[in-house]
Interface confidence: medium
């Protein structure tokens, strides 16, 4: 049975600033055919037929659900892209993370401007701070890492706060054990 394809993002963030670029790639098993990929944005078929969909100079209307399909194989699970205009944007490697998997958070400044005195918060409580911008890296996520995250920082000497982001860590599905 052919596997469902999977949409990946490069850079890996599904929350980006207006004007930024992101490439969505449709990955699957043995899909070597050229021009055989269908892309759907908010349910509408895109003109793009390559296995990569490039979003250049992102606009607000690029926000929404993306799915891909190879030949007549099932559609991929949806990936949701959000385009923002703000001073700070908290980006996550994933908003739903399997327990034991890594989680990366990034406090991203508008136009890639330097952000100083970056403080990450979880459920309203400061997690960690740095004088310069710094990503937070959680090597093995646990259910306790679930929560509402945001960051604050200085851009051009003024203090800003990102919109909150909900992160959910789900338990890995338990393997079935069969009695011999």
């Amino acid at each position: 049975v052919p596997q469902k394809p999977k949409v990946s993002l490069n850079p890996p963030w599904n929350r980006i600033f207006k004007g930024e670029n992101v490439t969505l790639t449709c990955n699957g098993n043995n899909f070597f055919e050229v021009s055989s990929t269908k892309w759907f944005h908010n349910g509408s078929l895109s003109e793009e037929t390559n296995s990569s969909l490039n979003i250049v100079n992102a606009k607000f209307e690029d926000s929404g659900e993306y799915k891909c399909q190879h030949q007549q194989v099932n559609e991929s699970e949806p990936v949701y892209l959000e385009v923002f205009s703000d001073w700070l944007l908290l980006q996550a490697s994933a908003e739903v993370v399997m327990e034991g998997q890594p989680l990366f958070l990034r406090c991203h400044g508008w136009r890639n401007w330097d952000v100083y005195k970056v403080i990450y918060y979880k459920d309203g409580e400061a997690l960690k701070y740095w004088y310069e911008n710094h990503n937070i890296s959680i090597t093995n996520a646990t259910v306790e890492d679930s929560g509402t995250y945001y960051c604050t920082g200085k851009v051009w000497q003024l203090d800003y706060e990102s919109e909150p982001l909900n992160i959910t860590v789900i338990k890995a599905p338990r393997e079935k054990y069969w009695l011999q």
Partner: antibody
Framework: EVQLVQSGAEVKKPGESLKISCKGS????????IGWVRQMPGKGLEWMGI????????TYSPSFQGQVTISADKSISTAYLQWSSLKASDTAMYYC????????????WGQGTMVTVSS | QSALTQPRSVSGSPGQSVTISCTGT?????????VSWYQQHPGKAPKLMIY???KRPSGVPDRFSGSKSGNTASLTISGLQAEDEADYYC??????????FGGGTKLTVL
């Protein structure tokens, strides 16, 4: 009251090991970086390194990298500075200091620990 | 990572003003606003007097002021008082979670 209380003065011989401590109270110890500063007799302040007790993330001054080890035990709100083999030139007053991200400075200092290394 | 450069000593009479300079590089003083000044009396721990170049913590008299131009920061003490006699150290963030201190300046109130 926010304070850092350091362990008492030490007199050691060259080659011996030592671990001095800095206990924080009156604030959430795991949430603020703690720095260590050396002051040799009659000399100025030298920044040695810093630790974030929440996850033991540590950064050293190049001058002190490999010479000392900075650690922390968050369960007892204590940071440590240790030597595996002391030298006479380690004779100094050592201060721990709490970093404050809102002032970009070390706002609270321990009283200092005098370490004397002599044969 | 070299120490910031401060004058060895300065002096002034009560009521006068004195300024202590602190020269670094674009990698420390010139590159960040995180410049602090500490006062240290003999046998005591340092005390924060100025942070973020020019801000005073509560309890520090407004006779103490700070400024910065390029790679040089300055501490000015106006209306000198006898209790101001102490050693003064500047400090700057130097990137990648490292700091650097100045060599210290001995202030004598004549």
């Amino acid at each position: 009251e926010v304070q850092l209380v350091q362990s008492g003065a030490e007199v050691k011989k060259p080659g011996e090991s030592l671990k001095i401590s800095c206990k924080g109270s009156g604030y959430t110890f795991t949430k603020y970086w703690i720095g260590w500063v050396r002051q040799m007799p009659g000399k100025g302040l030298e920044w040695m390194g810093i630790i974030y007790p929440g996850d033991s993330d540590t950064t050293y001054s190049p001058s002190f990298q490999g010479q000392v080890t900075i650690s922390a035990d968050k369960s007892i709100s204590t940071a440590y500075l240790q030597w595996s083999s002391l030298k006479a030139s380690d004779t100094a007053m050592y201060y721990c200091a709490k970093d404050n991200p809102f002032t970009g400075s070390f706002d609270i200092w321990g009283q200092g620990t005098m370490v004397t290394v002599s044969s | 990572q070299s120490a910031l450069t401060q004058p060895r000593s300065v002096s002034g009479s009560p009521g006068q003003s004195v300024t202590i300079s602190c020269t670094g590089t674009s990698n420390d003083v010139g590159g960040y606003t995180y410049v602090s000044w500490y006062q240290q009396h003999p046998g005591k721990a340092p005390k924060l007097m100025i942070y973020d170049v020019s801000k005073r913590p509560s309890g520090v008299p407004d006779r103490f002021s700070g400024s910065k131009s390029g790679n040089t920061a300055s501490l000015t003490i106006s209306g000198l008082q006898a209790e101001d006699e102490a050693d003064y150290y500047c400090s700057s963030y130097a990137g990648s979670y490292t700091w650097v201190f100045g060599g210290g300046t001995k202030l004598t109130v004549l």
